[in-house]
């Protein structure tokens, strides 16, 4: 089944329903393949094709493709956060796995029977793919869990999570993401947040906001949070330093537009 979590914090998504779909614009008329929006999105959008840049916040790669940082990428997770991955053929992924990920634990997890590990079907490793394979052993077994309701935000997806305890571990969220002074305040906030998240054992939704950053680490004009039940989240406009700009918010279906502001 799809019970086997991956290596890091896991976003659990709730089912899309008619109310969530009512938030969606009609899907693009001309698409080689339609997929759901990133993260826990409900609306359909065009899949990325082979060779296109991709990342954690971008559209998903199409069937049979995986979003992967290049093999010589010094900071692969950061590359995915930045959208500097590439949609590559799934067959190439296995060659990258040993480089990018620690080896999964050996079969035999105390909390799961053999039947559990082999009964269902799960998706093979990818940042943004809809291709599935019937091999649960692609998934390292349970790890850190975040409970996040699916939200829909046009610009990006925000995750709001709760946590019961916070680790005092000062280790960076990975050796590849040492803080760099040229990064802006948004990137620093994001990395601080992810630092905390990485070492929590169980998370459930109450208070961490992962901000929407541009490539230079400053705040993107539009910031959003997911709402309950995957309804469109509350959005607001900020300047490049993350300061809210008055007069630009939305709590309903209508989109907030932040075009006039300079925050990139």
């Amino acid at each position: 089944g799809a019970s086997s979590a991956g290596l890091g914090p896991v976003v659990r998504c709730e089912p899309c329903d008619a109310r969530a779909l009512a938030q969606c614009a009609p899907p693009p008329a001309v698409c080689a393949e339609l997929v759901r929006e990133p993260g826990c999105g409900c609306c359909l959008t065009c899949a990325l094709s082979e060779g296109q840049p991709c990342g954690i916040y971008t559209e998903r790669c199409g069937s049979g493709l995986r979003c992967q940082p290049s093999p010589d990428e010094a900071r692969p997770l950061q590359a995915l956060l930045d959208g500097r991955g590439l949609c590559v053929n799934a067959s190439a992924v296995s060659r990258l796995r040993a480089y990018l990920l620690p080896a999964p634990p050996a079969p035999g997890n105390a909390s799961e029977s053999e039947e559990d590990r082999s009964a269902g079907s799960v998706e093979s490793p990818s940042v943004s793919s809809t291709h599935r394979v019937s091999d649960p052993k692609f998934h390292p077994l349970h790890s850190k869990i975040i409970i996040i309701k699916k939200g829909h935000a046009k610009d990006s997806q925000r995750y709001k999570v709760d946590y019961e305890s916070q680790s005092t571990d000062t280790q960076n969220f990975s050796s590849e993401s040492k803080r760099e002074t040229e990064y802006g305040p948004c990137r620093r906030e994001m990395e601080d947040t992810l630092n905390h998240l990485k070492f929590l054992n169980v998370l459930s939704p109450r208070g961490v906001h992962i901000p929407n950053c541009d490539k230079k680490g400053f705040y993107k004009k539009k910031q959003c949070r997911p709402s309950k039940g995957r309804k469109r989240g509350f959005c607001w406009c900020v300047d490049k330093y993350g300061q809210p700009l008055p007069g630009y918010t939305t709590k309903g279906k209508e989109d907030v537009h932040c075009y006039s502001m300079q925050s990139k």
Epitope: G1, A5, S63, A119, H142
Partner: antibody, heavy 130, light 106 residues
């Protein structure tokens, strides 16, 4: 063996309530959701609702809103479906089914939207008759 | 709600025949389409998920295809144990089933 075992058949009068149980074994209960599906005699399958065994969140079919309540007891790995204000057209076999959790792994990029009903209970016949 | 329409509602076939069942969604559901087999007095059994992925333990004579609104379940060579009712199910927006296709012995 992964299985869902449901409670026995029930005969109820119109206006009464019924509570059907579904006991899971052979897998980590909280890693999945449970959906309930019913099938009237000689008819097709009708989805009734879903509950997350992880956090108890629910999503019910519109036509049953207000009459159905789904719950779980993680200590016994059991899901429950209660249907109130029973009518004759609620006569059906009621099934529970396991639903994998959709999830996205932030760090490794693992992603699954696999949410088909992969394991089913044997069914519970509920007859509503005066 | 998304409405799933199966055709035909029933069909007669012989052992060894190639059988095709179609399912149409009232709106695009990408590849969020599953197929189930149900025999009289039994619970349904998952055959195909995500439009074309074969569930573990299901014989390879079963295959699924399609994307968007039109989907097909194919049984390449019908076996005696395949006479049953088949249901499609969309899982894009919660879940809804098609009305079923009964495959009978000719």
């Amino acid at each position: 063996e992964v299985q869902l075992v449901q409670s026995g058949a029930e005969v109820k009068k119109p206006g009464a309530s019924v509570k059907v149980s579904c006991k899971a074994s052979g897998y980590t209960f909280t890693s999945y959701g449970i959906s309930w599906v019913r099938q009237a005699p000689g008819q097709g399958l009708e989805w009734m609702g879903w509950i997350s065994a992880y956090n108890g969140n629910t999503n019910y079919a519109q036509k049953l809103q207000g009459r159905v309540t789904m719950t779980t007891d993680t200590s016994t790995s059991t899901a429950y479906m209660e249907l109130r204000s029973l009518r004759s057209d609620d006569t059906a076999v009621y099934y529970c089914a396991r639903v994998p959790s959709e999830y996205y792994d932030f760090w490794s990029g693992y992603y699954t939207e696999e949410n088909a009903f992969d394991i089913w209970g044997q069914g519970t016949m509920v007859t509503v008759s005066s | 709600d998304i409405v799933m329409t199966q055709s035909p509602s029933s069909l007669s076939a012989s052992v060894g025949d190639r059988v095709t069942i179609t399912c149409r969604a009232s709106q695009s559901i990408s590849s969020y389409l599953n197929w189930y087999q149900q025999k009289p007095g039994k619970a349904p059994k998952l055959l195909i998920y995500a439009a074309s992925s074969l569930q573990s333990g299901v014989p390879s004579r079963f295959s699924g295809s399609g994307s968007g609104t039109d989907f097909t379940l194919t049984i390449s060579s019908l076996q005696p144990e395949d006479f049953a009712t088949y249901y499609c199910q969309q899982s894009y927006s919660t879940w809804t089933f098609g009305q079923g296709t009964k495959v009978e012995i000719k």
